[in-house]
């Protein structure tokens, strides 16, 4: 058929429209945010005109008085739900908390991402208040933590409804007892981290990384998972926006791979498999009241009553339309044309949609493709500032401005940061430390055996796409004998305080080193101490890199082991052995780089890489296969994605961004002591 | 301590209206919601609805809409519900109870008796 | 209007474990969040559970409670006689709540 022009407008079946006229959005908004009373502005006799310069000032818009378009866009962006003038009505006391150690529980999950995802935001969310404050904020698991947590839609048990997809977001009320300090968050809308749906992966050679979306396949765009260079028809991603370069990929949620929950332990489905007498080749809600999809793991249930419940496809899982909650069916036919991926082909609003069956024009079933969603941990910063007592903020670039914005630069605007201090003053200057004690060592985590799925191997990869080795980058000779060039500092305009995200952190000797980008800094514990540097790396270490992933010192041996992508140099003294490849450590080819490591008793460490690790012996320089395990088994409530793990006066640091969080060992227990900022908490830099 | 103090029983001709008073004590009454819960002879428990004592906002069920009324008077620390064109099979025990993510306090019962 | 079941009636021994499912019949009572409670002849409710597994202070540790796709469940180890009551699950659908029909647990 010739392809439709894109004046080709359809009227979709189920397309929720609004039909409030801009006056009648004006006056819900003005007083639904504090800018009018009750029924005061009801009525086109009524001038708008005062509330409007209001809400002008207090937004930083132009202040015409006027329902001009400025005002109406900001009208119509997603944004907090609390009031900008007036309160959540009028609570009692002065609304602040009075004690600095807050606690925190999650009250129940949105499906949006998985769960360590959004235990992961919360925490990072708090940490940026802790950062610039006293206060603290420990997760507890009861409704008596100060702050409570939930996801609800609607009308949620609080008097104040949330209102369906986008528009109210999130709301707050300030601190106090009961509901006073809780954060409520729309369950509507689309939670990510503000880049699209989090897909989580498993196998491949990513390490369980979510998926990219979109990327790149042979040429071609995807914004979902596909089975396009398969024959086995699993579902895979790439986990980088360019599968033909970097060849980094996972398999997504798919029942063909595994099933939850159910009796079945997890089997993948077999298809067909027959249940009351009829054979069924995908999984279905028959049978169910509750809608929830399932299969039989066997050829028949009748017979073997073996089940499980199929995983949800967050990539392709379409919201509104007249089909919410089911896939998107690639391809599909419209107006006599194939899709494979989502379309605005139809729409005048340039939203993305697709079929949920093969063909559009006979069964009329659609629903819109998943959007960048929003960022928990944004919206959750802003939520948590309310919960302590700020306001919003007519700053449009400060984290309390009203208006959802997405950014990945560091959140907090000096106007938070003011506002916050206000109420609670500044973070307490560290004390001089006294004499550290030596706690136990993290114990041998428990022998984990990966298993694989039966019909995948876990270094399988897409069949098609290049498969040529990783790159590494052009390293010097290696080179015996000490170096003779001295370690001078350069300017010192280059100052650690200055680095937002370090390389590699190791404690050598009893000082802390920090790398980055061919340099490097020495760091002394002691009041009123800076780091020393940055020296050259090169000159200290010839053989090195410029860019490392993780370093650590072996006590015993004095042994340097320095990580960089899938190679690894050993120094002692100012001798080197390597570069040599990770599988001669034992480490398999789906093991990408060395994120960390930690000391495990005598002579042996914990190497890590990603969300894994395994016990080291540094003297047979081997790890031990058997003793694989995953990094939140052994040390909950740490990020998932840390960039480096080390060692520092015998606590393990798990480094995120700009922030660490700190693991004291104690009896076996590993457990999160404090959250704070690597230049501020570790390095003392002064934080204005 | 934190309690919930419900007024006495009633007896009410059908079609008349009856305003059962509910007073808290031992927290802040308007950190909190109150739900009103009710309790026919011999059945299960009915959710009549909730107000959040902190904005005075309702949420009624759909069952009872046009019928109930819930109301607040946070000088008292008091909660009021209100149901009108009382039929015989409104007759229950009628609960108020604080209402933070899951109902914790509850008060004595109210019976209301329907009867012409 | 969700309806919520439950089976009206369970029974023990003393010592005995006693499991009350809890299943929603058009609504997905595994995204929500359930609450139980107890009540005794003659008195109010109490609350036993909230958020499908904590147990407020006060209530014995033999009380636990899960939540599972469509099921929730609570279950009570160690029956004792004063565990005598019924029992109801609670959980929120669009914007209302509702409550299971009960469960009488007989203690033999």
């Known amino acids: 058929a010739p392809r439709q022009r894109q004046s080709t407008l359809v009227l979709f079946p189920g397309d929720l429209r609004t039909n409030l006229t801009d006056r009648q959005l004006a006056e819900e908004y003005l007083y639904r945010y504090g800018y009018t009373r009750v029924a005061e502005m009801r009525g086109e006799s009524k001038s708008l005109g005062p509330a409007l310069l209001l809400l002008q000032k207090q937004l930083s818009l132009p202040e015409t008085g006027e329902l001009d378009s400025a005002t109406l866009k900001a009208m119509r962006t997603p944004r907090c739900g609390v009031p900008d003038l007036g309160r959540f009505q009028t609570f009692e006391g002065d609304l602040k908390w009075h004690h600095h150690n807050i606690t925190y529980w999650i009250q129940n999950y949105s499906e949006d991402l998985p769960r360590a995802v959004i235990d992961d935001a919360f925490a990072r969310a708090f940490a940026l208040w802790s950062a610039v404050t006293p206060l603290t904020f420990t997760r507890v698991y009861s409704r008596d933590a100060d702050i409570v947590i939930q996801f609800g839609v609607a009308e949620h048990g609080d008097g104040y409804p949330f209102d369906g997809k986008d528009g109210l977001l999130a709301h707050a009320f300030p601190p106090g007892p009961g509901i006073q300090g809780d954060a409520h968050f729309d369950d509507d809308e689309l939670w990510s981290l503000g880049k699209g749906v989090v897909v989580p992966t498993r196998f491949g050679n990513a390490d369980g990384a979510a998926c990219h979306f979109p990327f790149i396949f042979e040429g071609r765009s995807y914004s979902a998972c596909t089975t396009d260079g398969r024959s086995d028809g699993l579902p895979w991603c790439s986990t980088t926006a360019n599968y033909d370069t970097d060849d980094r990929f996972g398999f997504c949620p798919s029942e063909r791979l595994y099933t939850q929950d159910g009796n079945a332990d997890g089997k993948p489905c077999q298809f067909p498999f027959i249940f009351q007498g009829q054979s069924y080749s995908a999984c279905t809600t028959d049978g169910r009241s509750d809608g929830y999809r399932w299969c039989a793991t066997t050829a028949n249930y009748d017979r073997d009553k073996l089940f499980g419940f199929c995983p949800t496809r967050a990539d392709s899982t379409v919201m509104g339309g007249n089909s919410a909650g089911e896939l998107c069916v690639f391809p599909f036919t419209f107006l006599g044309k194939e899709y494979s991926t989502c379309t605005s082909e139809g729409r005048g609003d340039g939203r993305l949609w697709c079929a949920t069956t093969s063909n559009f024009d006979s069964d009329k079933k659609w629903g819109f493709c998943p959007d960048q969603g929003y960022s928990l941990f944004l919206v959750a910063a802003h939520e948590f500032g309310h919960a302590l007592g700020l306001d919003h903020s007519s700053v449009p670039e400060a984290l309390m401005y009203p208006m959802y914005r997405f950014t990945e630069g560091p959140p907090l605007h000096k106007d938070d940061v003011n506002g916050i201090r206000h109420l609670y003053g500044p973070r307490p200057e560290p004390e001089p430390r006294p004499p550290t004690t030596t706690t136990p060592q993290p114990t041998a985590p428990p022998t984990v055996c990966p298993t694989g799925p039966p019909t995948v191997h876990p270094s399988e990869r897409p069949t098609a796409g290049p498969t040529g080795p990783p790159s590494a980058g052009p390293t010097g000779p290696p080179t015996a004998g000490p170096s003779t060039a001295t370690t001078v500092p350069l300017s010192p305009v280059d100052d650690a305080c200055n680095v937002n995200i370090f390389d590699a952190i190791a404690e050598i000797g009893n000082q802390l080193y920090l790398f980055k980008d061919g340099k490097y800094w020495r760091f002394s514990e002691g009041r009123g101490s800076r780091p020393q540097g940055p020296f050259l790396i090169a000159d200290k270490w010839p053989a090195l890199p410029r860019k490392l992933d993780s370093v650590f010192e072996e006590r015993l041996s004095k042994k340097l082991f320095f990580f960089s992508g899938r190679q690894v140099w050993v120094y002692t003294g100012a001798s080197v052995l390597g570069p040599r490849r990770l599988d001669k450590l034992g480490l398999g080819a789906d093991v990408a780089q060395v994120t960390g490591a930690l000391r495990s008793g005598r002579g042996k460490m914990l190497l890590f890489s990603g969300r894994r690790l395994w016990r080291f012996d540094v003297k047979a320089q081997m790890v031990d296969p058997r003793s694989a395990s995953e990094v939140d088994r052994m040390f909950p409530g740490v990020p998932l994605d840390t960039h480096d793990v080390f060692q520092y006066r015998e606590k393990a640091y798990f480094c995120q961004d700009r922030f660490y969080w700190r693991v004291s060992s104690r009896s076996e227990l590993n457990q999160v002591d404090q959250v704070g900022y690597v230049t501020y908490d570790i390095l003392q830099c002064p934080e204005d | 301590e934190v309690q919930l103090v419900q007024s006495g029983a009633e007896v009410k001709k059908p079609g008349a209206s009856v305003k059962v008073s509910c007073k808290a004590s031992?927290?802040?009454?308007?950190?909190?919601?109150i739900s009103w819960v009710r309790q026919a002879p011999g059945q299960g428990l009915e959710w009549m609805g909730y107000?959040?004592?902190?904005?005075?906002?309702?949420n009624y069920a759909q069952k009872l809409q046009g019928r109930v009324t819930m109301t607040t008077d946070t000088s008292t620390s008091t909660a009021y519900m209100e149901l009108r064109s009382l039929r015989s099979d409104d007759t229950a025990v009628y609960y108020c109870?604080?209402?933070?993510?899951?109902?914790?306090?509850w008060g004595q019962g109210t019976t209301v008796t329907v009867s012409s | 209007q969700a309806v919520l079941t439950q089976p009206p009636s369970a029974s023990g021994t003393p010592g005995q474990r006693v499991t009350i499912s809890c299943s929603g019949s058009?609504?997905?009572?595994?995204?929500?969040?359930v609450n139980w409670y107890q009540q005794l002849p003659g008195t109010a409710p109490k609350l036993l559970i909230y958020?499908?597994?904590h147990r407020p202070s006060g209530v014995p540790d033999r009380f636990s409670g899960s939540n599972s796709w469509n099921t929730a469940s609570l279950a009570i180890s160690g029956l004792q006689s004063e565990d005598e009551a019924d029992y109801y699950c609670?959980?929120?659908?669009?914007?209302?709540?509702?409550f299971g029909g009960g469960t009488k647990v007989t203690v033999l």
């Open positions: 031992g927290y802040t009454f308007t950190s909190y919601g």
């Open positions: 958020s499908d597994s």
């Open positions: 107000i959040s004592a902190y904005n005075a906002n309702t």
């Open positions: 609670q959980a929120w659908d669009s914007s209302a709540v509702v």
């Open positions: 109870a604080r209402d933070y993510y899951g109902m914790d306090v």
């Open positions: 058009t609504f997905n009572i595994g995204s929500n969040t």
